[in-house]
């Protein structure tokens, strides 16, 4: 689940929790003890920005080699640069690790644009600002790549946090998080708070500022406001969910809900944009255009090919609508909605011409592989990947960018019937036909 469109930071602006904390329902309490509360050592352990990905510091090998690793909930391989590359400041040197074990097997991962390939092995891995454990994990040592590493992104590898079903070369390669849970007492859940800056960051600002938090094994109350609402994980491959309704400024898009999930809907921290199936994208843009019709924007802007700029501090946020996605709830016929602001879907970018303007790229784009709820969505929310209970939780992030008039929201319950019908069933390919 790599960049381009797949694959900006809280830096002293806003971000204070809004409103009052609501009492939690007893139903929300975890089954395992110690899964909630404060995880001080893990708060603020991410850096980066939505356009280039968020990364966590990890160590591999003995003695430990420190690397920055992209956090990607849209893939399932732990893969690190293991050979010199013009965009890498450092890379994993297997020959220097006394605990490296070669699996004598290669792996090749092509993307729509670009690819990486490497050699499989295992080694000892830990997360300095994570749980105080060391695990033996599978590592793909990337020896060759094309359009994978990003110049200036400051990460040297990728941590695929999804399920074994989509691991390469096949589902027998245990993903990192599975190894972590099996080998330690870390509960089978993690949560992400990705913090967009609301303005573009240069290299030194990214390094100096916080990008968010990955809480491994728990939920930290300080990272969200209000209540957590959960949607079922439909199938354990990607983090697949079901969208049951879409509104632009409260106006229903009125599409058959199957269209919203054609051919799937996933939560993917390794994708920059909110990506929507072609029909849904066209309907959404039409509705957003109508809502912001006080001024015509060129087609190139809506296609992400042009930037829009305003004199610094004068961006007319109010002319852009809020976007609400209704997600299937945990209770029959119950849904909840997550609402993002233009501050999330207009992504700050540097002006090529002058620094006197605030410039943005439209960060909603078209997809041929279903809905992808990328950083644009995730930057509004604290997202709990509760693998133990096969569900994903959303709450308003304490660091989301907003203004004095509107805030991102997570609200419910709403009555929604026949939500199961919204899921699309991907036809199963007969594996044997692929062998010829």
């Amino acid at each position: 689940t790599q960049h381009g469109i797949r694959l900006p930071l809280r830096s002293g602006l806003g971000g204070a929790p809004l409103g009052l904390r609501l009492p939690r329902e007893t139903d929300e309490e975890p089954e395992e003890p110690g899964r909630r509360g404060s995880f001080v050592e893990m708060v603020d352990n991410l850096r980066g920005k939505s356009g280039q990905g968020y990364y966590v510091e990890m160590t591999v090998g003995s003695p430990p080699q420190t690397l920055n690793i992209l956090v990607d909930t849209g893939s399932s391989n732990f893969a690190v640069g293991a050979a010199p590359h013009p965009f890498l400041h450092r890379y994993y040197q297997r020959q220097l690790s006394s605990t490296y074990r070669d699996l004598r097997k290669g792996v090749y991962v092509p993307y729509t644009q670009g690819k990486w390939e490497g050699e499989l092995g295992t080694d000892l891995v830990s997360i300095p600002h994570g749980p105080n454990v060391t695990v033996r994990a599978n590592i793909a040592a990337i020896t060759e790549s094309d359009k994978f590493f990003i110049n200036g992104s400051n990460w040297e590898g990728i941590l695929g946090l999804a399920y074994a079903e989509i691991a390469r070369p096949d589902d027998s390669l245990e993903p990192f998080f599975d190894s972590l849970v099996k080998q330690t007492h870390v509960p089978n859940l993690f949560s992400l708070q990705l913090c967009g800056a609301g303005f573009p960051l240069n290299q030194s600002e990214v390094l100096a500022s916080v990008g968010g938090s990955m809480i491994i094994g728990g939920i930290d109350h300080s990272l969200y406001t209000g209540s957590l609402w959960y949607t079922p994980i439909r199938r354990e491959w990607y983090y697949e969910v079901i969208i049951v309704r879409v509104e632009i400024n409260g106006q229903d898009l009125k599409m058959d809900c199957k269209e919203y999930n054609y051919d799937k809907s996933i939560v993917d921290s390794g994708t920059t944009n909110l990506r929507l199936p072609k029909k849904v994208f066209e309907a959404a843009v039409k509705s957003i255009k109508a809502a912001s019709s006080t001024e015509k924007f060129p087609d190139g802007f809506w296609l992400g090919e042009q930037l829009v700029c305003w004199q610094a501090g004068t961006t007319p946020w109010n002319i852009f609508p809020v976007i609400s996605l209704y997600l299937m709830g945990e209770v029959t016929n119950q849904s909840f909605r997550i609402t993002i602001l233009p501050q999330q879907y207009l992504r700050p970018v540097e002006d090529v011409a002058t620094s006197q303007d605030d410039c943005y790229k439209f960060a909603i784009s078209q997809s041929s592989t279903g809905t992808v709820m990328g950083a644009v969505i995730m930057e509004g929310f604290y997202v709990v990947f509760d693998r133990a209970r096969k569900r994903i939780g959303f709450a308003v992030s304490a660091c989301h960018v907003h203004d004095e008039f509107r805030t991102a929201a997570v609200e419910g319950p709403f009555v929604t019937l026949d939500m199961e019908d919204c899921g699309y069933n991907i036809p199963q390919t007969d594996e044997s036909t692929l062998m010829t």
Partner: nanobody, 121 residues
């Protein structure tokens, strides 16, 4: 929509010259600045030169005295005359335009596909 058409790139010996040009389609509110930036493999994007609608120009230090930007307002075209080229000028050169503000104060930035300039020693 703003369309940009670049031309003039190519290969040249160090010390040689090239002239890049970029033609932009008509735009209701006109263009308030046009210019060129470049990107060499593995390097950060660099703004080379800009020219505003009133004719004021700016250049990155490394090209001052060697490159000259000019424009033909009637044709919405911007040119970059590159003299005394050096191997370190090798890069893909992109034309960009920034429109003047519309009624909402919005300006739009567009960029071209880029034209390759290769300078060999």
């Amino acid at each position: 929509d703003v369309q940009l058409q670049e031309s003039g790139g190519g290969s040249v010996q160090a010390g040689g010259s090239l002239r890049l040009s970029c033609a932009a389609s008509e735009y209701t509110y006109g263009y308030c600045s046009m210019g060129w930036y470049r990107q060499a493999p593995g390097k950060e994007r660099e703004l080379v030169s800009t020219i505003t609608s009133d004719g004021s120009t700016s250049y990155v230090d490394s090209v001052k005295g060697r490159f000259t930007i000019s424009q033909d307002n009637a044709k919405n075209t911007v040119y970059l005359q590159m003299n005394s080229l050096k191997p370190e000028d090798t890069a893909k050169y992109y034309c960009y335009t920034k429109t003047c503000a519309n009624k909402l104060g919005a300006k739009f930035i567009s960029w071209g596909q880029g034209t390759q300039v290769t300078v060999s020693s």
